[in-house]
């Protein structure tokens, strides 16, 4: 015969632990139910009654199954120079991230401790790896046959246009110039953009910074902004 399923509260067998989503109450000496995310323990269990859970109040949350007497307070509202990427709900804390054009160079458990501007690749260099909320842009030199003529944190190296007759050959920072006869193949006008990191897509009331220099970091241990890559703007 299968073992009977015990309903909370119940006394565990000696040497055994309580089941998933249960906790051992020292006072009652029983296995009792935890409260689900978004709730907290309003009344602790006894030998005869299980935990009584209640919903978290406004601006408080619990993210895990728990038996805490009070929900945790959500962090303070994001300041005007940050973007709220996760709202405060009964089940999760609010998360504030850096404003558009910046990334988190030193993170904390929820949010950011230090924001730094996204590196911009100078002409002759394109974006090899786009910036994210927590990592800087990586620049790379434009390979032969490609160019970038912008200072940008999003533009990649683009192929030179192919001319029937070349007036001026292209280089890493300039497209080829064709003679008046039209080129056999031409790139669509305008720079090619990489998708922006999540934080730079957020709506924001503050003016968007457009960094023109990379953070000129000096001695830096892990988690700080990476030093400027070759081809980034800066000193």
């Amino acid at each position: 015969l299968p073992a009977q399923v015990a309903f909370t509260p119940y006394a565990p067998e000696p040497g055994s632990t309580c089941r998933l989503r249960e906790y051992y109450d020292q006072t009652a000496q029983m296995c009792c139910s935890k409260c689900s995310p978004g709730q907290h323990a309003k009344v602790f269990c006894t030998k005869t009654s299980d935990t009584v859970c209640d919903s978290c109040e406004d601006s408080t949350y619990t993210q895990l199954w728990n038996w805490v007497p009070e929900c945790l307070s959500c962090g303070s509202r994001c300041s005007s120079d940050q973007v709220e990427t996760q709202a405060c709900t009964r089940e999760q804390n609010r998360i504030c991230t850096c404003r558009p054009g910046w990334y988190c160079a030193l993170s904390k458990q929820e949010g950011c401790r230090l924001c730094a501007p996204l590196r911009k690749c100078r002409p002759g260099f394109g974006v090899a790896r786009p910036g994210t909320e927590t990592s800087d842009v990586v620049c790379k030199p434009c390979a032969p046959g490609t160019f970038s003529n912008t200072t940008s944190s999003t533009d990649i190296c683009r192929p030179h246009q192919i001319c029937n007759v070349v007036a001026i050959p292209g280089n890493a920072s300039m497209d080829a110039v064709c003679t008046s006869t039209s080129p056999t193949r031409s790139m669509a006008p305008g720079a090619v953009h990489l998708p922006q990191p999540v934080s730079t897509r957020s709506q924001h009331t503050q003016p968007t910074p457009e960094p023109s220099t990379a953070p000129s970091t000096s001695f830096l241990l892990p988690m700080g902004p990476s030093p400027p890559a070759e081809g980034s703007t800066g000193d």
């Epitope: 300041s79 005007s80 120079d81 940050q82 850096c98 054009g101 988190c104 030193l106 904390k108 949010g111 950011c112 401790r113 230090l114 924001c115 730094a116 501007p117 503050q206 003016p207 910074p209 457009e210 960094p211 023109s212 220099t213 990379a214 953070p215 000129s216 970091t217 000096s218 001695f219 830096l220 241990l221 892990p222 988690m223 700080g224 902004p225």
Partner: antibody, heavy 119, light 107 residues
């Protein structure tokens, strides 16, 4: 309320080292970056670097990186800035400062520590 | 390093009049500029950040403007307690640098 209280004035000889302390209160010490800024007499302000007490992350101004060491004692919520190979031009008021959010404008400052380098 | 250059070095303005201090960055710092007020024997006090956002408790006679490389701090109606040295600082990237300061006096 947030307070940064610095150690007292120091007089040092050229070539010596000085260690300035900055005791933090009113917030969780390991949650905020501490910066050091100096001001020579009658001169402007000069950023020396930052130090994060929570994980020992450091970023020194290139100008000082060979001579400056920033450390901390978490148990007493105190940050330290040591400057070695002192010269007369290091005579200045040294401030610790912190910023509330993730951008580096300083909303809290220590009262300053005067360091005089003289033979 | 980004050099912040303030003008003028000193300024005398009559009480109730407007005072304007300029700050020029050697390269684009977007809008990442802060302004501080410093009185003798005291540490600097934050007035404005992100070019134009007033810090908590700062009177609304203080305002900031600009972007890119040119920035301005304006005191719309000078009060006696505004006599101090004013510094701009870019909070863009390391190393964070300050202007040389502008001494504001009463005419």
């Amino acid at each position: 309320q947030v307070q940064l209280v610095q150690s007292g004035a120091e007089v040092k000889k050229p070539g010596a080292s000085v260690k300035v302390s900055c005791k933090a209160s009113g917030y969780t010490f390991t949650e905020s970056i501490i910066h050091w800024v100096r001001q020579a007499t009658g001169q402007g302000l000069e950023w020396m670097g930052w130090f994060y007490p929570g994980s020992d992350n450091i970023n020194y101004n290139e100008k000082f990186k060979d001579r400056v060491t920033m450390t901390r004692n978490t148990s007493i919520s105190t940050a330290y800035m040591e400057l070695s190979s002192l010269r007369s031009e290091d005579t200045a008021v040294y401030y610790c400062a912190r910023h509330e959010g993730p951008y580096v404008y300083f909303d809290y400052w220590g009262q300053g520590t005067t360091v005089t380098v003289s033979s | 390093d980004i050099v912040m250059t303030q003008s003028p070095d000193s300024l005398a303005v009559s009480l109730g009049e407007r005072a304007t201090i300029n700050c020029k960055a050697s390269q684009d710092v977007s809008t990442a500029v802060a302004w501080y007020q410093q009185k003798p024997g005291q540490p600097p006090k934050l007035l404005i950040y992100w070019t134009s956002t007033r810090h908590t408790g700062v009177p609304d006679r203080f305002s900031g403007s600009g972007s890119g490389t040119d920035f301005t701090l304006t005191i719309s109606s000078l009060q006696a307690e505004d006599v101090a040295v004013y510094y701009c600082q870019h909070h863009y990237s390391t190393p964070y640098t300050f202007g040389q300061g502008t001494k504001l006096e009463i005419k």
